[in-house]
Structures are given as structure tokens and as C-alpha cells.
């Protein structure tokens, strides 16, 4: 039977008189044009919708916007739009939202083609008070805070001026010219690179890195010949030219540019880009564009310095630069990632990573699934998710995956069971364990959020007609109801809840259409009444994360640890509650060989734990270039796995020798960097 | 200024299709509606259906419904109205009107502007 | 649909008169109501719309008013140009037209 139909699916009582006096609507008077939704701060019940609508006249487009402002999570809503003085807020710089719980708002004006600057509207109360400023110059980005202080804010200007306030946008002062890119590092520290010549269209790959860590009074050139620049967990990273061709490399520096060391990944040329698909303290995925129009490369991962990379995972679907990658972090299970691959037969299949990229594999067939058209063995097959490529595609998926940290091992995914990716109309899956085990949870697409730390999963089905149903599970996806929460139906645009997965409210955005009205409006349903009371200590199951073989010592072991998680059982209907935090107990496993990666020269053949020689390196000397030293490295081709925590058992020789010889990587050495003030 | 101009006059058999086109010129339909009101000899105004432009939606009216089909180009500001399986009753003044809509920027003004009507005649 | 019934159907009336015409919606309307003015082989003039609201360009001697379901177009003096025949239309949902009042001269 389908999922949500079986006989022992008990149903919540009388939950339709208890969702019907939590349902909220409100109509908003305006024009169907565009609608943003932004939270200010966290647990504080502050939404911000800004819709925008455009009026085409005969010579141009004018613009008209409101602003509406709700304090308890969506219920009720305030036109606030006099506070920013009925002016045309522009929607491609959306809300700026400070940082954490600052309750700062920046919103950037549109202004009049011949004013001397932009104008922002700024709230430091959650959106309560607006205070209007005129800017000396116009916005080319949306303003960024920076992360340790929202008192400070940049931007750069159409005419590419790196513009700074130390006063929340109050005053700005100009710090550099001739910027093209600039972004917040740790300890209020910009890095930014500038342009020589003409523009940063015609300099790139001449650009210079600068660093200022006084917002501007000094600066620091730290690197030459720069194509772009990343910043990824504690690891800066430089993509430089080199000097005799058009090829570029891969620098990075764990000291905020002082220092660089050349990356060990291949070389790309005008064609190829890198990307960091995910970095933290640990470690970095970088995915290296293959030559030619491929549409796919390979994901290397970084040691801990991020300098030595292995190979994780070849053919990795990345269409062009700033295109479209499935890769995913699964965020409810540590160490798990999802992504795609492109088959020699130009099929897309998904694979799963459960130990930070040491290996791939295939996801399980779901027991209640039957193998696609695609599959040539219609026993054997394997779950296929839609992420962003198939969405870019405009296949019938309207989310991706879906998982958060605080509702343990919940993964939530459109896909099909076969031997690939099919293009026929998706089902939605849920895995409550991390992405080894799966199951159908629904028929057809739809959209879906997490609500109270897993407690309830929320879904609405996506159809291009006009609806009025939504479904809840308060049992991880294994039963639904159906709630009707509005008696005409509108066109549905979206889901909206708080970020986090906290909150047990859930928005239901949409408008309804007439011949002569077309309103937006909002349906905000709570569902604190259904789950009636807090969770108690029996409500609650141990669990021991990444288990596949309970008889096995080992067994759950990942990255040197294992951890058992207190998990609300699927029987429990209760809150767990805003303040709900995850209790884990971690213990420390001996260390295997799946503790290790691969060293640089060694590579791990598929199903097989052990790292052997790459074949072109066989018999030659490991040597690479680091800190502007050559370093010889004796391996017996393994190295421990950033983050990995295993102690005794298997331990590999790893040994590096100083080669106390210069070996410089056409960047700008330590000594030669110079430092201006301003 | 807008203006509406539509296409002339039709004379069509029992049974055939006619497709009026309404042009606004001095101007784009943006969001506003577009109705076509028709005119029988003799007797009072009657709203078959209207579209609005932007949004590429249309209405019809109970009576015209699976009979009336009404388009919209946004990149020529032209509206069509075309009537299928014609009667001889259908024989009428055919108009398109501009109208705004009730709710956010546009504020409800009634028909402000009309089509100086076509002329369909259906006669065997 | 929302029926709109419309009185009297003609009225004859002379120059400076002042003249009334009623229109009645089957169900609440809010002021969602135009009144239009329509001379023979003409197309309809939009005189009065969201009930009470002059179109510009519109001489003041009509107005309008009522809401819910009753509504009046009055000419507070009728002049030679204003025989003509007047219909009102509401607009909450699709659209429909009263059946017509016609101003004749007495």
C-alpha cells in the first residue's frame, strides 16, 4: 500500500478542530508582482514580506513596493510601508539581515537616474523604526555585515569603490577603487581584489589580492596574477595564473594570506574553473573542471592544511561555472554528502559519501519501491535524488533534499529507483538514518519542511492548479493526514518556516486570482495544539548513528568516533520544543584504514579499503612545494582523515623531509609582499 | 494617450469561427485588464470574457465558456477574442475595453478606454 | 453570477431636469459599481466608477452612490448631450451589466 495508508497508522485526534483554530490567513492588497520573505533575528517571531510590483509605462518600468512587517511568526501582518516612506525598495538586493540577533535591517532604494547616490532604509529594532540615508554612492551589491561586528558594513559601488561604514551605515567612507570582489574574513578583516588597467572583466587573472584588517586605515597586497579568490572554513584560497600559459592554480592560505602554498590539484585551463563545493576548520571539497565542455570534473579532498588533496570521486556532475552542482551536505548526519556523477553513457546517477568523502556509494533501493524503466536489472537498482541540476533542467522538482542539523539523520529527497536519474514524474523519499536506509514517503512532488526538530514534517503537493490541502507526519514520514486549510484554494508559491526547523509554525504562501483582483496571500498554521504535550525522558530512544553492523565492535565507527543520539521514537506525539538540543554521546574508536585517505600519488580503487600508487607516479619522488619550500614526503600512501579522532590500532608511516631547497609557485612569496597605510 | 483599435468588420456563416484583434497604441497593457463586451442589435451591453495581458489569464463569462477563447501578445499590446461555432444571434457589435484592476497599484477605474468596435455579422 | 437589475428601463425627461436611475445587485457588490453613458453607434463612456468616483473629464452634474447592493446615478440637470442610454456594471468577481436605462426627451 502507499505510504501514510496502512492499517496501523494511527491518526491524530481531532486535529482539525485544533488546526482550524491555528490557521491565521492574511490578504494582502496588492498586486500579484514578486513577494520576499526574510526572518530578523531567531526565536524573536519577526518576519519581514516585502512585495514588489512593476508598472510598465511606455518609456520605462516603474516600480511600487510595500512592506509588511509580522511579530508572531506569520499570523498577523503591519503595512509598514510608511516607515520607509512609501519608497520602491529594489528587490535584487533584497533585505539585508544582520547577523545573529542584531535585529539590523538594510533595505537599498531605488532612486531617481540622476541622484549623486543610493539610499537605504536601516533598523537596528527588528523593523520597528526605520531610519532613511542617503548614500555618496550607488550600490552595485547588497550591503554585507561583517560576521563579528554588524556594526560594519561594505559594499561596492557601480563604479567599483570598496565603500565601508563603522556605523551601521550611518557614514561610509571609500577605502579602495578599481574593486572587483570583496568579502569578510575572520576578526573584521576584508579581502579584496583590484584591477590595474582597464576593468576586472579585462584584468582577470592579473588582479591583485589585498588584505586590510583595520577596515581600511592599511592594507596589505597578498598575491599577484589572481584570477578569483575563496574563503572556506579557515582556509583562504587563490586561484593564480601561471606564468607562461593560460593555465591557473589553486594557492591557499591558512594565516589570512601571509603565507601561501601551491594546492596539489591539477592545473586548469581558460575553460575549466574550480569550485569549493564544502569546507569547515578541517578540511575542503574541491571540485576540478575536467577540459572541454564536459559538464563534469573531480571532487579532491584537502588534508588539514589543505594542501595535499586525494581524489574522492571522478566524473562529478558540474556544469559550467556558476552552474549547477547536486552536491549536498547532509546536515542531520556527520560526514554524510550526496551528490551526482555523469556515467560514461551520459546517464545521472546520485552517490553518497557517509565518511567525508573517503568513499562513494550508490543509495540503497527503498524496500517499498519498484526498480524504473531505467534499470536493466529490475531486482538491482538504486535511489536516485533530484537536487539542483534537475531542477535547473525544469524537471517536476520543486525542492532539494532537505535536512537539518537538529532533527537527527532526516533526509528528505525527490527521486526515482532505477539505474539513473529519471526524467518521468518524481516521489518524494525519506531516510531517518543518514541516507543508508530509504523509503517512500510520498507519491508524486511535492513540497516539504521540517517543523519542531523533526517532530512534524509538513508537505504540500506541488500541482500547477490552485489548492487547499496540507499534509502533516508525526511520525518521520511513515503516516499523513490531510488538513484542508482554506476553503477556496489558491495558487501555492511556497513554504515558509523559521530557520532553524525550531518553530511548529509553518506559512503558506500563495495568491488568488480573479478577473480583477490578485492578492497574495498568507496561511499560517501552528501546531502546537497537535502536539499537546513536552516530551518526556521515555518519549525518547538511544540510537547509534552510521550503524550497519551491530555485531561488529566497530560498528558506527566514522571518522575515528561513533556517536549515539538521544532520537524521539516514531510512536511519540509531543513537542520537543524550541530550546530542544541534540544529546550525543561520542566515544572514541582504534584507528582502521578507513581512517585514512589516501596520500597524494596514492589512490583508492573502488570496494577496496587499501590506497595504492597512482600509475603515473609510480617510481618517481613525491615532492611538492610548501610555504616556498620544496618538501619530499615518504608515504606508504595513507594519511589520517581531517577530523578523524581514532587513536591505536592501524598506524601508517607518514614521514615528511624538508628538501631545504627554494621552490617558489609564480605567487608573491612572504618577503616580497609589501604593505601600504593609508 | 492609449487607444484601442481593432479590426474591422467580419461577415461569417453559421457555424464558422471569428478572431477580433485589439491593438493599444500610445501605450503598453501592462497590467491592466482587457474586456470584450458585446453588443447586440438593439439590446444592452453583455461581458463575454476578458484577459490580463501580463499574467497571460483568462476569464470568460458562464454563457461564452468553451466557446470564446481570448489571447493576449504582450509584445505587439494586442488582444484577440476569437468566437467559435457562430450563430446567428452571435450577430453583434463586438468591443474590447481597458480596465483596471481592483487591488494593490492599480487602482479601480471601470472600463476607461474602449475599442471603436467590430462589426460581426453571421448570416447563412 | 451577480445579477444587476436596472430602473426604470426608459425615462423621459426634459432639459435641467434632475434625474435618477437606480441600479440593484442581487448580492453585496461593496462599491465595486461603474455607471457608463452610451449614445447610439457609439462605444460606452465611462462616467462614474468604484461607485462615486468622477472620471476625468466628466462634467459634475453626474455622480454617484450607494453601496452593498443599491446604487443611483443622478444628473442633477439634465442637458441636451446627456440623452443617451446609461448602464451600470458591477465588478466584484466577473463582470456583468444592469439591462439599461434610457434618457429620452419628454
Known amino acids: 500500500s502507499a505510504p501514510g495508508e496502512d492499517e496501523e497508522c494511527g491518526r491524530v485526534r481531532d486535529f482539525v478542530a485544533k488546526l482550524a483554530n491555528n490557521t491565521h490567513q492574511h490578504v494582502f492588497d496588492d498586486l500579484r508582482g514578486s513577494v520576499s520573505l526574510s526572518w530578523v533575528g531567531d526565536s524573536t517571531g519577526v518576519i519581514l514580506v516585502l512585495t514588489t510590483f512593476h508598472v510598465p509605462l511606455v518609456i520605462m518600468t516603474f516600480g511600487q513596493s510595500k512592506l509588511y512587517r509580522s511579530e508572531d511568526y506569520g499570523k498577523n501582518f503591519k503595512d509598514i510601508t510608511d516607515l520607509i516612506n512609501n519608497t520602491f525598495i529594489r528587490t535584487e538586493f533584497g533585505m539585508a539581515i544582520g547577523p545573529e540577533n542584531s535585529g539590523k535591517v538594510v533595505l537599498t532604494a531605488e532612486v531617481s537616474g540622476g541622484s549623486r547616490g543610493g539610499r537605504i532604509f536601516r533598523s537596528s529594532d527588528f523593523a520597528k523604526n526605520f531610519v532613511q540615508t542617503d548614500l555618496p554612492f550607488h550600490p552595485l551589491t547588497q550591503m554585507m555585515y561583517s560576521p563579528q561586528n554588524s556594526d560594519y558594513l561594505l559594499a561596492l559601488s557601480t563604479e567599483n569603490g570598496l565603500w565601508v561604514s563603522k556605523n551601521f551605515g550611518g557614514k561610509w567612507e571609500e577605502i579602495h577603487k578599481a574593486v572587483c570582489l570583496a568579502k569578510w574574513g575572520s576578526d573584521n578583516t576584508i579581502f579584496f581584489t583590484t584591477y590595474a588597467n582597464g576593468s576586472c572583466k579585462a584584468d582577470l587573472g592579473a588582479l591583485e589580492l589585498w588584505r586590510t584588517s583595520d577596515l581600511g586605515k592599511s592594507f596589505k597586497t597578498i598575491g599577484v596574477k589572481i584570477y578569483s579568490f575563496g574563503l572556506g572554513g579557515r582556509f583562504l584560497f587563490a586561484s593564480v595564473m601561471a606564468d607562461k600559459d593560460t593555465t591557473r592554480r589553486i594557492h591557499v592560505s591558512t594565516d589570512q594570506g601571509d603565507t601561501w602554498s601551491m594546492a596539489q590539484l591539477p592545473s586548469v585551463g581558460q575553460e575549466q574553473f574550480y569550485s569549493i563545493l564544502a569546507a569547515n576548520d578541517d578540511m575542503v571539497f574541491m571540485h576540478v573542471d575536467e577540459p572541454g565542455d564536459t559538464g563534469f570534473g573531480t571532487i579532491f579532498t584537502s588534508d588539514d592544511r589543505g594542501i595535499v588533496y586525494s581524489k574522492s570521486l571522478d566524473r562529478h556532475l558540474y556544469t559550467t561555472t556558476g552552474g549547477e552542482t547536486d552536491f549536498t551536505n547532509v546536515t542531520s548526519l556527520r560526514g554524510v554528502y550526496i551528490t551526482s556523477v555523469l556515467s560514461e553513457d551520459n546517464s545521472i546517477q546520485t552517490m553518497i559519501t557517509f565518511d567525508q568523502g573517503g568513499r562513494w556509494t550508490h543509495l540503497r533501493k527503498p524496500e517499498n519501491s519498484e526498480c524504473d524503466a531505467t534499470a536493466k536489472n529490475k531486482n538491482e537498482c538504486s535511489l536516485h535524488i533530484h537536487a539542483s541540476y534537475s531542477i535547473s533542467q525544469k524537471l517536476n522538482v520543486p525542492m532539494a533534499p532537505l535536512s537539518e542539523p537538529n532533527a537527527v539523520g532526516i533526509v528528505i529527497a525527490h527521486g526515482s529507483v532505477g539505474d539513473a536519474i529519471s526524467v518521468m514524474v518524481p516521489d518524494v523519499y525519506i531516510s531517518d538514518d543518514g541516507g543508508y536506509s530509504w523509503t517512500k514517503m510520498l507519491e508524486g512532488p511535492h513540497y516539504y519542511t521540517i517543523l519542531d526538530s523533526g517532530g512534524i514534517i509538513v508537505a504540500i503537493e506541488h500541482s500547477s492548479r490552485p489548492i487547499n490541502v496540507i499534509k502533516f507526519s508525526t511520525d518521520e514520514g511513515q503516516c499523513w493526514q490531510t488538513y484542508t486549510f482554506t476553503r477556496d484554494p489558491i495558487y501555492f508559491t511556497g513554504l515558509a518556516s523559521e530557520p532553524g526547523a525550531r518553530s511548529m509554525n509553518i506559512s503558506i504562501w500563495g495568491f488568488t486570482e480573479s478577473f480583477l483582483t490578485s492578492q497574495w496571500v498568507s496561511y499560517t498554521i501552528d501546531f502546537k495544539d497537535i502536539l499537546e504535550r513536552n516530551c518526556e525522558e521515555k518519549d525518547y530512544t538511544i540510537w547509534l548513528a552510521h550503524s550497519t553492523d551491530p555485531e561488529d565492535y566497530e560498528d558506527g565507527c566514522i571518522l575515528g568516533y561513533k556517536e549515539q543520539f538521544l532520537r524521539l521514537r516514531k510512536s511519540s506525539v509531543c513537542q520537543n520544543g524550541r530550546d530542544y538540543v541534540v544529546t550525543k554521546q561520542p566515544s572514541i574508536c582504534l584507528c582502521s584504514l578507513e581512517d585514512f585517505l589516501c596520500d597524494f600519488g596514492y589512490y583508492r580503487p573502488e570496494n577496496d579499503s587499501k590506497c595504492v600508487e597512482q600509475p603515473e607516479l609510480k617510481g618517481h619522488d613525491l615532492e611538492f612545494c610548501l610555504y616556498g619550500r620544496e618538501e619530499h614526503l615518504t608515504t606508504n600512501g595513507y594519511r589520517k582523515i581531517p577530523g578523524d579522532k581514532c587513536q591505536g590500532g592501524v598506524n601508517p608511516v607518514r614521514e615528511v623531509k624538508d628538501l631545504k631547497k627554494k621552490c617558489t609557485s609564480n605567487f608573491l612569496s612572504p618577503e616580497k609582499q609589501n604593505s601600504k597605510s593609508n | 494617450q492609449v487607444q484601442l483599435v481593432q479590426s474591422g468588420a467580419e461577415v461569417k456563416k453559421p457555424g464558422a469561427s471569428v478572431k477580433v484583434s485589439c491593438k493599444a497604441s500610445?501605450?503598453?497593457?501592462?497590467?491592466?485588464?482587457i474586456s470584450w463586451v458585446r453588443q447586440a442589435p438593439g439590446q444592452g451591453l453583455e461581458w463575454m470574457g476578458g484577459i490580463i495581458p501580463a499574467f497571460g489569464t483568462a476569464w470568460y463569462a458562464q454563457k461564452f465558456q468553451g466557446r470564446v477563447t481570448i489571447t493576449a501578445d504582450e509584445s505587439t499590446s494586442t488582444a484577440y477574442m476569437e468566437l467559435s461555432s457562430l450563430r446567428s444571434e452571435d450577430t453583434a457589435v463586438y468591443y474590447c475595453a481597458r480596465q483596471g484592476r481592483k487591488t494593490g497599484y492599480y487602482y479601480y477605474y471601470g472600463m476607461d478606454v474602449w475599442g471603436q468596435g467590430t462589426t460581426v455579422t453571421v448570416s447563412s | 453570477d451577480i445579477q444587476m437589475t436596472q430602473s426604470p428601463s426608459t425615462l423621459s425627461a426634459s432639459v435641467g431636469d434632475r434625474v435618477t436611475i437606480t441600479c440593484r445587485a442581487s448580492?453585496?457588490?461593496?462599491?465595486?459599481l461603474a455607471w457608463y453613458q452610451q449614445k447610439p453607434g457609439k462605444a460606452p463612456k465611462l462616467l462614474i466608477y468604484k461607485a462615486s468616483s468622477l472620471e476625468s473629464g466628466v462634467p459634475s452634474r453626474f455622480s454617484g452612490s450607494g453601496s452593498g447592493t443599491e446604487f443611483t446615478l443622478t444628473i442633477s440637470s439634465l442637458q441636451p448631450d446627456d440623452f443617451a442610454t446609461y448602464y451600470c456594471q458591477q465588478a466584484d468577481g466577473h463582470i456583468t451589466f444592469g439591462g439599461g436605462t434610457k434618457v429620452e426627451i419628454k
Open positions: 448580492q453585496s457588490i461593496s462599491s465595486w
Open positions: 500610445g501605450g503598453t497593457f501592462g497590467s491592466y485588464a
